[in-house]
C-alpha cells in the first residue's frame, strides 16, 4: 500500500458543497475507489469492464459520484464546520496487473465563506 | 471459511439440457465476478463462461456459445449454468470460481476460490 | 486465441531440488495477465501466482513467478512433499485460457 498526500488540487469548493477529486492513471482499467473521512467510508465505487469493452459501475456507499477517464470525483454537499477532517482516496487496482491499493490524502479545511447558509 | 458447491450434475443425453448451481457461502457474493471452468477426468483445463457481480457482463467459450447461459441470484448467492443441446464432448467435472481481487469483474482477473465440481456425462 | 504450451510435460523430482516450469504462449500476453495454478488428484485447482510474479495469499515464498511477453517460468525453490502435482498456467486477459500442464513427481 502506497500512502501520500494528493500532488493535486483534491478540493474544488462551489455552491455551499465540495469536489472531492480523487485521481487514478490513464492505464487503469478495472478498480475500485474509496472515499475515506478519517477511517470511515464515506463512498465506494468500482468500475469493471467486460468483453466489447462494456463498462458496468457499482456504487455500494452511494455519493454522487462522477467518472472520467482519470478520475472519480465524489460530491459532499450542505458542508459545516463537521466535514472538516483528513479525506483519502483508496484507490483498488484490478486491472493491469499487479493488483495495488494506493492511498492519497489531504485536509478540508472549512471557511465561513466556503458554508452554504452562511447568516448575513 | 469460503465455500463453493456445485450441484446439478449427471448424465444426459446428446441433444439434453441440465442447469447446474453453485451455492456461496463465507463471502459478500456481490462483491464478486465468477467464472465456470470445466476439466474433463485426467486432462487440462478449460474456461467456460463468466459472469460480473450483477449478470450485466457475460462471455463465453466459443465451444459452448449459443448452447450455454451464465446466471446468478445475488439473493441466493448462487451461480447457474444453463446447458442445453449438449454434446459428448461437453463431459466433464463442471468448477465454479470466483475473481481472485473481490473486483466485481470475471473480464482479466484470476480465480482463487473454486469448487469441488460437480460431473456432467453426455452418452447415449 | 493465445495459445499456451507447457515444458516440460513431466519433471521427475526430489524433495528439496528445484523446480523450473516453463509457460511459452502463441502471442504476447498483455500487461502480464499470466497465472499458475496447482491442481492435487481429487482437488480444485489452487491458485499461485498471479500478474507472472505475484504470490497469491497465503502461497508460501518457495514459489516465485517470472517472465514477460512470449515466455513464463514457475520456479520451485526446494520441493517439498506436498509440492507434487499437477501445475497449470494461465493467460487470463480476455478469454482465458490454460495451458496442458506439468506434472511434477517423485523420482
Known amino acids: 500500500e502506497i500512502n501520500g498526500s494528493a500532488n493535486y488540487e483534491m478540493f474544488i469548493f462551489h455552491n455551499g458543497g465540495v469536489q472531492i477529486l480523487c485521481k487514478y492513471p490513464d492505464i487503469v482499467q478495472q478498480f475500485k475507489m474509496q472515499l475515506l473521512k478519517g477511517g470511515q467510508i464515506l463512498c465506494d465505487l468500482t468500475k469493471t469492464k467486460g468483453s466489447g469493452n462494456t463498462v458496468s459501475i457499482k456504487s455500494l456507499k452511494f455519493c454522487h459520484s462522477q467518472l472520467s477517464n482519470n478520475s472519480v470525483s465524489f460530491f459532499l454537499y450542505n458542508l459545516d464546520h463537521s466535514h472538516a477532517n483528513y479525506y483519502f482516496c483508496n484507490l483498488s487496482i484490478f486491472d493491469p496487473p499487479p493488483f495495488k491499493v494506493t492511498l492519497t490524502g489531504g485536509y478540508l479545511h472549512i471557511y465561513e465563506s466556503q458554508l452554504c447558509c452562511q447568516l448575513k | 471459511e469460503v465455500q463453493l458447491v456445485e450441484s446439478g450434475g449427471g448424465v444426459v443425453r446428446p441433444g439434453g439440457s441440465l442447469r447446474l448451481s453453485c451455492a456461496a457461502s463465507?463471502?459478500?457474493?456481490?462483491?464478486?465476478?465468477m467464472s465456470w471452468v470445466r476439466q474433463v477426468p485426467g486432462k487440462g483445463l478449460e474456461w467456460v463462461s463468466g459472469?460480473?457481480?450483477?449478470?450485466?457482463?457475460?462471455d463465453y467459450a466459443d465451444s459452448v456459445k449459443g448452447r450455454f447461459t451464465i446466471s446468478r441470484d445475488n439473493a441466493k448467492n448462487s451461480l447457474y449454468l444453463q446447458m442445453n443441446s449438449l454434446r459428448a464432448e461437453d463431459t466433464a467435472l463442471y468448477y465454479c470460481?470466483?475473481?481472485?481481487?473481490?473486483?466485481?469483474?470475471?473480464?482479466?482477473?484470476?480465480?482463487?476460490?473454486w469448487g469441488q465440481g460437480t460431473l456432467v456425462t453426455v452418452s447415449s | 486465441e493465445i495459445v499456451l504450451t507447457q515444458s516440460p510435460g513431466t519433471l521427475s523430482l526430489s524433495p528439496g531440488e528445484r523446480a523450473t516450469l516453463s509457460c511459452r504462449a502463441s502471442?504476447?500476453?498483455?500487461?502480464?495477465?499470466l497465472a499458475w495454478y496447482q491442481q492435487k488428484p481429487g482437488q480444485a485447482p489452487r491458485l499461485l501466482i498471479y500478474?507472472?510474479?505475484s504470490r497469491a495469499t497465503g502461497i508460501p515464498d518457495r514459489f516465485s513467478g517470472s517472465g514477460s511477453g512470449t515466455d513464463f517460468t514457475l520456479t520451485i525453490r526446494r520441493l517439498e512433499p506436498e509440492d507434487f502435482a499437477v501445475y497449470y498456467c494461465?493467460?487470463?486477459?480476455?478469454?482465458?485460457?490454460f495451458g496442458p500442464g506439468t506434472k511434477v513427481d517423485i523420482k
Open positions: 463465507g463471502l459478500t457474493f456481490d462483491d464478486y465476478g
Open positions: 459472469i460480473n457481480w450483477n449478470g450485466d457482463n457475460t
Open positions: 502471442q504476447s500476453v498483455s500487461s502480464s495477465y
Open positions: 470460481a470466483r475473481d481472485y481481487y473481490g473486483s466485481g469483474s470475471y473480464y482479466n482477473v484470476p480465480f482463487d476460490y
Open positions: 500478474g507472472a510474479s
Open positions: 494461465q493467460q487470463y486477459g480476455s478469454s482465458p485460457f
